[in-house]
C-alpha cells in the first residue's frame, strides 16, 4: 500500500512552495522568446551517459552488474556510470538507431520532424493550459509519492547534457497517478529562459513562467524506456512552474550551487541525495493532466503530463544562476531551452479541481465547457 503525500490544507496562493494559482500577467510568447517549433527543450531528458537518441537521455533498464552488488533490479533502470555509480542510476538508452536524434538543437536546423518524425505528431507537448476550458475530473486523486526523500548516499549524477541540466534518480522512487497507474521516477531536469525572458515549456493562458521542472517517470508496466516510448501512459512527467519569490529555496540550492562545476556541455558531477519531493509544490491534489509527448526528440507521444497548479518559488538570484551558468553546444549559453507550445488538436486538458471557477484572475464568470473523460478512473 502506498501512503499519499500528506496534504497540508494550505490556503490558496499560500504555502512555502509558491502560489496556488500559477496565473500571472499576460505574457504571450513572442517570436523571440519561443524557440521555433523544432526546438524542444532538453525535455524528457532521460538519464543518460551521453546524449542519446532522443529524450536527451533515455534510461535503459538492465540487470545489475555483479560488481555493483547483489541487487535484483530486473525492472529498474540502472547505470554503470563513471564517477559514482553508487548503484543503479538510470542508464542511458544507448542504441544509436536514431542516429540523428542526438543532433538536434533549439531554434535551428535540422527541423525536429527530420530528426524524429514523431515531432510532427498531432498530440505534442508542451501546450498552453487554459483553466477555463479544463474539464474538472473528481476522479483525479492526489498524487502519491513513495521513497522520494533520498539519503545523501548514494550520490546522484548531475549532468549538463547540452540541452538541460539533468539529475539522474536512483531506483525506488515510486509515483502513483491513481489506482493501478504506478510509475518509477527516472530523472528530473529543468527548462529556463534568459535574463528578463521566461523559459517554462507549458504556459497558462499564454503566460510563460520563468522556469519549469520535469520529473520523468516510467510505467511499472514496462522494463525499459524504449519499450514504453509511444505507448499510452508508458511515460509520465510531473511538471511544475518555477517563479520568483523573496527567499532562497534551500532544496533547489543543493543543485543550483553545483552548476558552476558542470558549466561545460557534457560535464557532470556527483551531488548528495536530497528530498526530491521538496523540489515540487506542496499541494499534490490540484493539477492539470493531459496526454502529450516528450518535448524533445524523439517527441514520442502517449506521455501523461501532470502540471501542478501550485508553483515553486526560487529567489531572483537562484533563477539567474539557473539561466546564466551553463553552456551548450558551440560555445553558446544554455538558455531558452524550451519548445514552443503545440496545438491541442482536440485534446481536453483535465483538472483535478474546478479550475474554471474563480481560480484565475481573468475568470470573468465560471465556465466549464468540457466534461471529465476519466470519470471511471
Amino acid at each position: 500500500q502506498r501512503l499519499p503525500r500528506m496534504q497540508e490544507d494550505s490556503p490558496l496562493g499560500g504555502g512555502s512552495s509558491g502560489e496556488d494559482d500559477p496565473l500571472g500577467e499576460e505574457d504571450l510568447p513572442s517570436e523571440e522568446d519561443s524557440p521555433r517549433e523544432e526546438d524542444p527543450p532538453g525535455e524528457e531528458d532521460l538519464p543518460g551517459e551521453e546524449d542519446l537518441p532522443g529524450e536527451e537521455d533515455l534510461p535503459e533498464v538492465k540487470p545489475k552488474s555483479e560488481e555493483e552488488g547483489s541487487l535484483k533490479l530486473e525492472d529498474l533502470p540502472t547505470v554503470e556510470a563513471p564517477g559514482d555509480p553508487q548503484e543503479p542510476q538510470n542508464n542511458a538508452h544507448r542504441d544509436k538507431e536514431g542516429d540523428d536524434q542526438s543532433h538536434w538543437r533549439y531554434g535551428g536546423d535540422p527541423p525536429w520532424p527530420r530528426v524524429s518524425p514523431a515531432c510532427a505528431g498531432r498530440f505534442q507537448s508542451p501546450v498552453d493550459i487554459r483553466p477555463q476550458l479544463a474539464a474538472f475530473c473528481p476522479a483525479l486523486r492526489p498524487l502519491e509519492l513513495l521513497g522520494f526523500q533520498l539519503p545523501p548516499l548514494p550520490e546522484l549524477r548531475l549532468r549538463n547534457n547540452g540541452h538541460s541540466v539533468q539529475l539522474t534518480l536512483p531506483p525506488g522512487l515510486e509515483m502513483a497517478l491513481g489506482p493501478g497507474r504506478e510509475y518509477r521516477a527516472l530523472q528530473l531536469h529543468l527548462h529556463w529562459g534568459a535574463a528578463g525572458r521566461p523559459g517554462s515549456e507549458h504556459t497558462v493562458e499564454g503566460h510563460r513562467f520563468p522556469a519549469e521542472i520535469h520529473v520523468v517517470h516510467l510505467s511499472t508496466a514496462f522494463a525499459r524506456v524504449d519499450e514504453a516510448l509511444g505507448r499510452p501512459g508508458g511515460l509520465a512527467v510531473l511538471a511544475a512552474f518555477l517563479e520568483e519569490g523573496p527567499e532562497e529555496n534551500s532544496a533547489y540550492e543543493q543543485l543550483l550551487s553545483r552548476l558552476e562545476e558542470i558549466a561545460e556541455e557534457g560535464s557532470e558531477t556527483q551531488v548528495p541525495g536530497l528530498d526530491i519531493s521538496a523540489l515540487l509544490p506542496s499541494d499534490f491534489s490540484r493539477y492539470f493532466q493531459y496526454e502529450g509527448s516528450l518535448t524533445t526528440p524523439p517527441c514520442a507521444q502517449g506521455v501523461i503530463w501532470t502540471v501542478f497548479n501550485q508553483t515553486v518559488m526560487l529567489s531572483a538570484k537562484q533563477l539567474h544562476t539557473l539561466s546564466d551558468t551553463l553552456w551548450g553546444p558551440g560555445d553558446s549559453r544554455l538558455q531558452l531551452n524550451f519548445r514552443a507550445t503545440q496545438p491541442l488538436n482536440g485534446r481536453v486538458i483535465e483538472a483535478s479541481f474546478p479550475a474554471g471557477v474563480d481560480s484565475s484572475p481573468r475568470a470573468a464568470e465560471p465556465v466549464q465547457l468540457n466534461s471529465c473523460l476519466a470519470a471511471g478512473d
Epitope: 553508487q86 548516499l153 548514494p154 550520490e155 531506483p171 525506488g172
Partner: antibody, heavy 118, light 108 residues
C-alpha cells in the same frame, strides 16, 4: 567478489584514540559511498558515519560528531574511522559497509571489536 | 530523533510464516530496508526498498509496507532463518540513517 575487511580494533582507555581501517576489494572503490555502523555488545545496530565516493562529503551521527572523523584513500581502496576522546559507550563491534542502491548498506564487513575500558 | 519499533521476538514453527513488523510515523513514505544478522555474523541485506529482494536471497523472503508499518515476511521458515532482523530507513528530518531495535526470530 565484493569484500570488506575491517582492522584496527582493540582495547583502549577512555579519552584515548584509535583508528579503524576497512580494506575494500572486488569493486571500484571510488565509485561508492561508504559507511561505518556499530553494534554494542548484546545491542542493536547504530549508524555512525558515512562518506561519499570522492571523499568530499562526510556525515556523522550526533553521538560521535566532533570526536570521530571518517576518511578514505581511494588509491589504497581503504576506508578509515579516526576515533578520538573515546568513551565507554563507544564499546562495540564496528562494521564498514558499502552504500547500497537506495540508502541501505550492502555488503558489510565482518566487523572489528573496539573496547573502551580503564 | 524519531524511532522505529519492532517486536523483541517472534517465534514460529518450521514451515510456517513469520511476520516481523517495523512501525514508524509515515514509514509508508520511506524506503525501508531489512537486514538479517545470524549469531556471531555481520548483517546482510535481505530486502531493500520495502519489497525488493537482492539476488541470492531466497524467494521466501518478502516485504510490504502500509501507512505506518513495514513488514518482513518469511515464508516456510527454516532453522537457518533463526537470526535477528533489523529494519532501517533514512530519516530526512533528523538527517540520520535509523535502525529499528531488532527482532529475534526463533524457529520452534
Amino acid at each position: 567478489e565484493v569484500q570488506l575487511v575491517e582492522s584496527g580494533g582493540g582495547v583502549v582507555q577512555p579519552g584515548r584514540s584509535l583508528r579503524l581501517s576497512c580494506a575494500a576489494s572486488g569493486f571500484t572503490f571510488s565509485s561508492y559511498g561508504m559507511h561505518w555502523v556499530r553494534q554494542a555488545p548484546g545491542k542493536g545496530l547504530e549508524w555512525v558515519s558515512a562518506i561519499s565516493g570522492s571523499g568530499g562529503s562526510t556525515y556523522y551521527a550526533d553521538s560521535v560528531k566532533g570526536r570521530f572523523t571518517i576518511s578514505r584513500d581511494n588509491a589504497k581502496n581503504t576506508l578509515y574511522l579516526q576515533m578520538n576522546s573515546l568513551r565507554a559507550e563507544d564499546t562495540a563491534v564496528y562494521y564498514c559497509a558499502r552504500a547500497a542502491v537506495t540508502g541501505g548498506f550492502d555488503p558489510w564487513g565482518q566487523g572489528t571489536l573496539v573496547t573502551v575500558s580503564s | 530523533q524519531p524511532g522505529l519499533t519492532q517486536p523483541p521476538s517472534v517465534s514460529v514453527a518450521p514451515g510456517q510464516t513469520a511476520r516481523i513488523t517495523c512501525g514508524g510515523d509515515n514509514i509508508g513514505r520511506k524506503s525501508v530496508h531489512w537486514y538479517q544478522q545470524r549469531p556471531g555474523q555481520a548483517p546482510i541485506l535481505v530486502i531493500r526498498d520495502d519489497r525488493d529482494r537482492p539476488s541470492g536471497i531466497p524467494e521466501r523472503f518478502s516485504g510490504s509496507s502500509s501507512v505506518n508499518t513495514a513488514t518482513l515476511i518469511i515464508s516456510r521458515v527454516e532453522a537457518g532463518d533463526e537470526a535477528d532482523y533489523y529494519c532501517q530507513v533514512w530519516d530526512s528530518s533528523s538527517k540520520h540513517y535509523v535502525f529499528g531495535p531488532g527482532t529475534k526470530v526463533t524457529a520452534l
